[in-house]
Structure formats: structure tokens, C-alpha cells
């Protein structure tokens, strides 16, 4: 069954945590649907963003952070492992020095920590996708 | 009650027709939600687009056409009558020489016909909005 989009969930992250998302683009890549995942510092959507991950399907991926309300230096990748009309599984793992983004089991993107992942309080998944799974796995202590 | 988004409806347009849309942005303007309305030449979403109207809320509106699969010259406006979190009523009227776009009763944008409006077979409304009304009014002959 489908989860509501935008989908918002409270989350605490640290090294070893993984956020897993399953979904499908809602339009053909010719029409450039988007997927966005934002790791926020508060439960409010206007809050700062520790990790911003935006896919323009068929075109590019941009990653960034929003600090004190201002967007910082954007990181862009043309790597496009997503397929038109097909379900994807996205997993974002918190490594000691960076986020590692896997698409359908393949390491596809990395983003160095700019703000410690412990600052994350909420994850939002939104834009032009249907969402069937959202999970945050916590490292067993 | 809410209409599904993306929302697709078969439509025939000619001078005097008006497409009316009521909706609300799904995210705060700081996060740049989008609204898109596309007038297609076929019931397929990959088909050509006679009139493409895209709002990046808080930033700009772009209008264009997609002919033989290729985007043409983009028309951009910074006029931003939409408000954060508030319902909008958008009406697109087919005039003899152009489309006239009204936002909350005010003429806000125009786009000269590049392809005759009679070529339109389908209208799609999508991206980061909730949709409460979609109507096509036809000129009484």
C-alpha cells in the first residue's frame, strides 16, 4: 500500500544508521519528474537541511545542505541508475565521514558530512514519486 | 475531496474554452514546490505539449511548448501572485491569439499560440500540489 507523499518521519541518525526508501517515479523521464529526500534539523519543513538529495529523473542528481537558512555548495552527479517507470530501492547509509547512497543495491553517490548526522531530527521524502516503503534502521548498540 | 495527482483528463479546446484548477502548494515556498499544467496533443504523457505552464513557487513561472519531442523557446515571468500554504484558483482561457492565465481572478500571464489549441487532446496537472477542482468549460455554440 502507498505511503502519503510528502512523507515526513521523525528520525535520529548516527554512524551505522540506514534510511531505506522504495518508490516509483510518477511520470516518464521525458517529463522530468523529481524525487527529493531531505534530512532536517527540526520537525519543521522550514528548518535547516543536513543532507538534501534531489533526483531529476533522467537528468541529474544534486546534493547540498541548507545551513542557517542558506543553501551551500551544490554537489552534482550525472550518474542515473534509476529507470523509467520502474520501482527503485534507495538506501542512504551513515558512514563515519559521509553519506553513502545506494540505488538498487549499487553504490551510486556519496556526500561528505558538513553537519554531524546526530543533528537530524526528521526525514522528508517528496516530489513526483509514489512511495511504498520508508524505514530507518538503527545500529544495535 | 482531493483529486489524484498527477491528474489527467481528456479535453478539447478552442477559442472561448477555459480550464479552471483549484489547489494548494504541498510545501513551504522556502523548499520550492512546483505546479505544472501541460496541454498535450495525445492522451499519452510523452506526447507533444501545446502549452506547458510550470510554477516554481516563490521563484518564477516558465511557459513553453514541446514540438516533435523538443522544447522550444522558454518564456519566463517573475510575477508571483501565489501565496505560501494558501489555496489558489488558476484559470487558463483560450483567446483567439493566446492563452490568458488568471490567478485568483487576476490576469497574471499570457502565452501566444504556437500550435492551434484544437490540437489539445489531454490536460495534465501535477507536481507538488493538492488538487480540489479541475474543470474545462466549453464555449456554447
Amino acid at each position: 500500500s502507498l505511503l502519503p507523499v510528502p512523507y515526513t518521519e521523525a528520525a535520529s541518525l548516527s554512524t551505522g544508521s540506514t534510511v531505506t526508501i522504495k518508490g516509483r517515479p510518477l511520470a516518464c523521464f521525458l517529463n522530468e519528474p523529481y524525487l527529493q529526500v531531505d534530512f532536517h534539523t527540526e520537525m519543521k519543513e522550514e528548518s535547516d537541511i543536513v543532507f538534501h538529495f534531489q533526483v531529476c529523473f533522467g537528468r541529474r542528481v544534486v546534493m547540498n545542505s541548507r545551513e542557517y537558512g542558506a543553501w551551500k555548495q551544490q554537489v552534482e552527479s550525472k550518474n542515473m541508475p534509476f529507470q523509467d517507470g520502474q520501482e527503485f530501492e534507495l538506501s542512504i547509509s551513515v558512514l563515519p565521514d559521509k553519506y553513502q547512497v545506494m540505488v538498487n543495491g549499487q553504490s551510486s553517490y556519496t556526500f561528505d558530512h558538513r553537519i554531524k548526522p546526530e543533528a537530524v531530527k526528521m526525514v522528508q521524502v517528496w516530489r513526483d514519486i509514489s512511495l511504498t516503503k520508508f524505514n530507518v534502521s538503527y545500529l544495535k548498540r | 475531496s482531493l483529486l489524484p495527482v498527477p491528474y489527467t483528463e481528456a479535453a478539447s479546446l478552442s477559442t472561448g474554452s477555459t480550464v479552471t484548477i483549484k489547489g494548494r502548494p504541498l510545501a513551504c515556498f522556502l523548499n520550492e514546490p512546483y505546479l505544472q499544467v501541460d496541454f498535450h496533443t495525445e492522451m499519452k504523457e510523452e506526447s507533444d505539449i501545446v502549452f506547458h505552464f510550470q510554477v516554481c513557487f516563490g521563484r518564477r513561472v516558465v511557459m513553453n511548448s514541446r514540438e516533435y519531442g523538443a522544447w522550444k523557446q522558454q518564456v519566463e515571468s517573475k510575477n508571483m501572485p501565489f501565496q505560501d500554504g494558501q489555496e489558489f484558483e488558476l484559470s487558463i482561457s483560450v483567446l483567439p491569439d493566446k492563452y490568458q492565465v488568471m490567478v485568483n481572478g487576476q490576469s497574471s500571464y499570457t502565452f501566444d499560440h504556437r500550435i492551434k489549441p484544437e490540437a489539445v487532446k489531454m490536460v495534465q496537472v501535477w507536481r507538488d500540489i493538492s488538487l480540489t477542482k479541475f474543470n474545462v468549460s466549453y464555449l456554447k455554440r
Epitope: E46, R66, Y68 | L30, K78, N79, G85
Partner: nanobody, 121 residues
Framework: QVQVQESGGGLVQAGNSLRLSCAAS????????MMWFRQAPGKEREFVAA???????YCANSVKGRCTISRDNAKDTVYLQMNSLKPEDTAVYFC???????????????WGKGTLVTVSS
């Protein structure tokens, strides 16, 4: 936290132009939507113009065609250019900052103290 301060008001002849400035301080200025309002003696505060954090703009019907709003994020400043001024434009002009792009004075997060504009016929 954002502090805002207006300047550029004064006495102007009808038909002339005026540019008001709003200087903001605070490291989050670029993420705020900025608005101008005005209040004539004995009247409610009314919306004049808005510029979103990403540069979208809107002017109220009362000033449409005579109003240009712009911002310079490098200088943390917003400008309101008013042309073809009329005596009914006489008011105290206020600059405001908001995290929400709305044209409602009650939704503003921060206000300046205002600058008086008097248009003489």
C-alpha cells in the same frame, strides 16, 4: 534573528519617483521573503509588494504598474521603487521579513520601524 531598517522616505512631488531601501542584518536574510506594507494616517496597514527568497515578485493592485521590488542578497538589502507617485501614496512604509510568502501583516516575523513618505500635489 533578522533586524530590518527602512530608509529613503521624505517629501516628494506628485508624479515623481522614489526608491525606498530596507537594510537587514542577520545571517539568514537570504532565506526570508521580504515585504513592503504601508499605513496611511487613520487607516489599516496594507500590503504593497513582496519579493520571495528566490526572487519571485508581486505588487498590490493599488501600485501595479508603478512598483518594482528587488533584492540584493550580497548587500542584505531590499528596494522598493515607486513611480508616478500620487497624494494617496502618502503613508509610513514598513519593511517586513517572513519565512512564509504571504501578503498578510499578521504573518510577518520581523518588522522595521517605518519611513514616512509624503506626496504633495
Amino acid at each position: 534573528q533578522v533586524q530590518v531598517q527602512e530608509s529613503g522616505g521624505g517629501l516628494v512631488q506628485a508624479g515623481n519617483s522614489l526608491r525606498l531601501s530596507c537594510a537587514a542584518s542577520g545571517r539568514t536574510f537570504s532565506s526570508y521573503h521580504m515585504m513592503w506594507f504601508r499605513q496611511a494616517p487613520g487607516k489599516e496597514r496594507e500590503f504593497v509588494a513582496a519579493i520571495a527568497w528566490r526572487g519571485g515578485t508581486y505588487c498590490a493592485n493599488s501600485v501595479k504598474g508603478r512598483c518594482t521590488i528587488s533584492r540584493d542578497n550580497a548587500k542584505d538589502t531590499v528596494y522598493l521603487q515607486m513611480n508616478s507617485l500620487k497624494p494617496e501614496d502618502t503613508a509610513v512604509y514598513f519593511c517586513a521579513a517572513s519565512l512564509r510568502y504571504v501578503f498578510d501583516p499578521s504573518a510577518m516575523d520581523y518588522w522595521g520601524k517605518g519611513t514616512l513618505v509624503t506626496v504633495s500635489s
